[in-house]
Interface confidence: low
């Protein structure tokens, strides 16, 4: 069937449309189109005869059509007029003719809209205000945004006059926002520039900030006044009454006891004509007196000295508080403090004693600080420790050690190598060490204030080969399930990798077993029977891998639960009984018998010659470790027929 | 009995990466370091650098800082090599070795090898 | 890096025959270890730490040296040693190894 399909429907005012023809039937003579929804020879456009290919314009022709051979009919340059149906007539070559009906529409491109307001300045719980977009257009559809977002839903927004006017009753200071009106018809859409609605409000109750209503004599006192209000508010201070200043903060340097009283805030709306205020009474107090520490010893000794701090000056009626290193006072029997809290004394002062310490005075309004105190506590020197630990050295390299020893004043330290002093420094450096640098290195440190010295003594060897390490342990005799064990390979050296070996094997994985110290260090957690095994330790660098001779843990445990043999319980009148016992134990344990309670002997075997049945009965077996410090037992009945 | 069995035969584009495997058995790689050599044609023994499984410490020879990385997954015993931006010039058989840590740290295992061909 | 220089860079011997290679650093090491190997096999350990014989190589093998100037010997050649050694260090990084010398059977 033919049929004309136009595109596109819809045609802006001043585009082109096609009239486009579907389904034309083979064999044609021609065709002509019509303005119009029938064939009607003065409203003829154009006519197209297929054999001379000639386009014959007709009574409607506006010389913006142009005819195409598949019979398609294009219409540029579109005026409204344009609207409206258009039939195509086809004379086939039998003159059998056929006919179709097309139509379209004609919009015209739509400007860009504004907003009118009836109010530009409407104020908030009171007036209401009317948008409309212009202009008024016909077969428009007029759309509202408010911050880019579509209307929300609310009883206080009404659309009319088409959805052209939005009224939105009974404004609030939220209603101040970007306004946009939109304009569609189906060739076209345009949005308005925003439009932003200035809402009058206020002013609210205002605050005043700070909140804190106390202060001290000698401050400064700054108030500050903040009201919302569109347009801002305009800010008047009143004390007790009494105008003050029209500004927004009120300050008042070096208050005295006599500036307390009622501070009222007062913000002003010209606009829409509003007073609010608020007010806030302020208290001033009289400035106690800053406190400060005394101490009877400036320059206490560790261990023998004590020290009095007193707190200044003496107030009567004054709640006395101390602090130190920042917290109340711990509970220690060092300390101790005078009935009114005054004075702290520390009894026999310790390094740990510097402090600082801090005393308050307390009034009704806040908690007055001292300064703080350190003490200077004279210490030490205690025993020096040498830097790095290592006692090897590879050849070629730098010997760098320092020394230190907790000390107060700070120790003066020598160095000594085989005896011979070398220099007075914390730090002893050698550069490009060989085998003849071996030795042994002291460190010397002394307090000048208490005269007293301390020495250490390190042996250093160097050689690029390392030596034989060997195995020291913190506990040579563990208990089973009770102990830990710690071997440590010696000796320590620089980039140097430990390994280990138990009877020969790499390390088993165990939860007991735990390497550290970059595995120098060997911890057997909860020591086992089955630990008692030799251990090997081996230490590589870059030129030698040795490893230790074996050392063997001697894990004491026991005594287990015995076992009494031979295992038979009935015997013949006149049979010998021979008895004995045996529990495992490291060492060996201790054993003992009970025949019916009684005890026996304390030997492992137990012999009767001739029993009888008056030798029925329980005979116990006892053992005892006193290495493990622990007990065993088991009863054994004995049965003896005539 | 100690076995390093690698991945087989890589053909890669210049500019391209590929990640080679090698997988120990008869041991634990956590106990031992694991050494990548490399060895190019008709050339000799290249060390590419080491990676200690059980903590993930490395050690890579300068010429192979950025072109070379070592990973391990200990659940599988499995070490690797990842090698980027390849040239012809990475075109190599590539080699696992274990470490021994029971003595001094010489090359004991050696894998089968893992050819890489790069082509442009 | 520490540079090995190996030489020959090639040679051949007879059955029976005396071998010496020998491996020159370009700066001091403490050992020096020796690898062969044959075409299309992985290396395999001779001689560790300059003259300890690794595990299942035979007694011929020996190595000596110090400093920086070692040697590899194989006292008496046999058939199974043509292959291609290479001498390794391992006192500092990068590890490094030497061209290596081929061994060819006469």
């Known amino acids: 069937k033919l049929t004309i399909e136009s595109t596109p429907f819809n045609v802006a005012e001043g585009k082109e449309v096609l009239l486009l023809v579907h389904n034309l039937p083979q064999h044609l003579f021609g065709y002509s189109w019509y303005k119009g929804e029938r064939v009607d020879g003065n409203r003829q456009i154009i006519g197209y005869v297929i054999g001379t290919q000639q386009a014959t314009p007709g009574p409607a022709y506006s010389g913006r059509e142009i005819i195409y051979p598949n019979a398609s009919l294009l219409i540029q340059n579109i005026i409204q007029n344009d609207t409206g149906f258009y039939t195509l007539h086809v004379i086939k070559s039998d003159l059998v003719n056929e006919e179709a009906t097309g139509q379209f529409r004609v919009y015209p491109e739509l400007p860009k809209p504004s907003i009118s307001s009836n109010n530009s300045k409407p104020v908030e719980d009171k007036d209401a205000v009317a948008f409309t977009c212009e202009p008024e257009t016909q077969d428009a559809t007029y759309l509202w945004w408010v911050n880019n977002q579509s209307l929300p839903v609310s009883p206080r927004l009404q659309l009319s006059n088409g959805n052209r006017t939005l009224t939105l009753f009974n404004v609030t200071r939220n209603d101040t926002a970007s306004y946009k009106c939109e304009t569609q018809n189906p060739v076209s859409a345009r949005r308005s520039d925003s439009v932003i609605l200035n809402v009058l409000y206020g002013p609210d109750a205002p605050t005043i900030s700070p909140l804190n209503t106390s202060y001290r004599s000698g401050e400064n006192l700054n108030l500050s006044c903040h009201a919302a209000s569109n347009p801002p508010a305009q800010y008047s201070w009143f004390v007790n009454g009494t105008f003050q200043q029209s500004t927004q903060e009120l300050f008042i340097p070096n208050i005295t006891v006599n500036n307390s009283g009622s501070y009222t805030c007062q913000a002003h709306n010209s606009d829409t004509g509003l007073n609010r205020t608020t007010v806030t009474t302020i208290t001033v107090y009289a400035e106690p007196p800053k406190p400060f520490i005394t101490s009877n010893n400036s320059n206490p000794v560790e261990d023998e000295d004590a020290v009095a701090l007193t707190c200044e000056p003496e107030i009567q009626n004054t709640t006395y508080l101390w602090w130190v290193n920042n917290q109340s006072l711990p509970v220690s029997p060092r300390l101790q403090l005078s009935n009114d809290n005054r004075t702290l004394t520390l009894l026999s002062v310790t390094r740990n004693d510097v402090g600082p310490y801090e005393c308050g005075i307390q009034n009704e309004l806040s908690v007055d600080h001292s300064d703080p105190v350190i003490l200077n506590v004279l210490y030490g020197p205690d025993d020096p420790t040498i830097s790095p630990s290592y006692t090897y050295y590879r050849p070629g390299v730098n010997l760098s050690l320092s020394c230190h020893a907790a000390s107060n004043p700070p120790a003066q330290y020598s160095w000594l190598i085989d005896g011979n002093i070398q220099q007075h420094t914390q730090e002893l450096f050698i550069s490009n060490i060989t085998e003849k640098n071996s030795g042994l290195y002291t460190c010397q440190a002394n307090n000048s204030a208490s005269g007293h010295s301390r020495t250490t003594v390190k042996t250093i060897t160097v050689s690029a080969e390392l030596p034989k390490p060997s195995i020291s342990s913190n506990n040579s005799k563990p208990v089973e399930d009770k102990d830990a064990v710690a071997f440590t390979c010696e000796p320590e050296a620089q980039n140097t990798t430990y390994l280990w070996w138990v009877n020969g094997q790499s390390l088993p994985v165990s939860p007991r077993l735990q390497l550290s110290n970059g595995n120098r260090t060997l911890t057997l957690f909860n020591v086992t029977r089955n630990d008692a095994r030799a251990y090997v330790c081996g230490i590589q660098n870059s030129v030698s891998a040795n490893r230790s001779d074996p050392v063997t843990l001697d894990v004491l445990y026991g005594p287990d639960t015995p076992i009494i043999s031979p295992p038979d319980s009935s015997y013949l009148s006149g049979a010998n009984l021979n008895l004995s016992c045996h529990s495992a134990s490291n060492p060996s344990p201790q054993y003992s018998w009970r025949i019916n309670g009684i005890p026996q002997q304390h030997t492992q075997v137990l012999f009767i010659a001739k029993i009888t049945p008056n030798n029925n009965g329980t005979y116990a077996c006892f053992v005892s470790n006193l290495a493990t410090g622990r007990n065993n037992s088991i009863v054994k009945s004995i049965t003896v027929s005539a | 009995q100690v076995k390093l069995q690698q991945s087989g035969a890589e053909l890669v584009k210049s500019g391209g990466s590929v990640k080679l495997s090698c997988t120990a058995s008869?041991?634990?790689?956590?106990?031992?370091?694991m050494h990548w050599l490399r060895q190019g044609p008709e050339q000799g023994l290249e060390w590419i650098g080491w990676i200690d499984p059980e903590n993930g410490d490395t050690e890579y020879a300068p010429k192979f800082q950025g072109k070379a990385t070592f990973t391990t997954d200990t659940s599988s015993n499995t070490a690797y090599l990842q090698l980027s931006s390849l040239t012809s010039e990475d075109t190599a058989v590539y080699y696992c070795?274990?470490?021994?840590?029971?003595?001094?740290?010489?090359?004991?295992?050696w894998g089968q090898g893992t050819t890489v061909t790069v082509s442009s | 890096e520490n540079v090995l220089t190996q030489s020959p860079a090639i040679m051949s011997a007879s059955p029976g025959e005396k071998v010496t290679i020998t491996c020159s650093a370009s700066s001091s090491v403490s050992y020096m270890h020796w690898f062969q190997q044959k075409p299309g096999t992985s290396p395999k350990l001779v001689i560790y730490?300059?003259?300890n014989l690794a595990s299942g190589v035979p007694a011929r093998f020996s190595g000596s040296g110090s400093g920086t100037s070692y040697s590899l010997t194989i006292s008496r050649m046999e058939a199974e040693d043509a292959a291609t050694y290479y001498c390794q260090q391992r006192s500092s990084y990068p590890l490094t190894f030497g061209a290596g010398t081929k061994l060819e059977l006469k």
């Open positions: 008869g041991f634990n790689i956590k106990d031992s370091y």
């Open positions: 730490s300059t003259s």
């Open positions: 070795n274990e470490g021994t840590p029971t003595g001094p740290y010489y090359f004991d295992y």
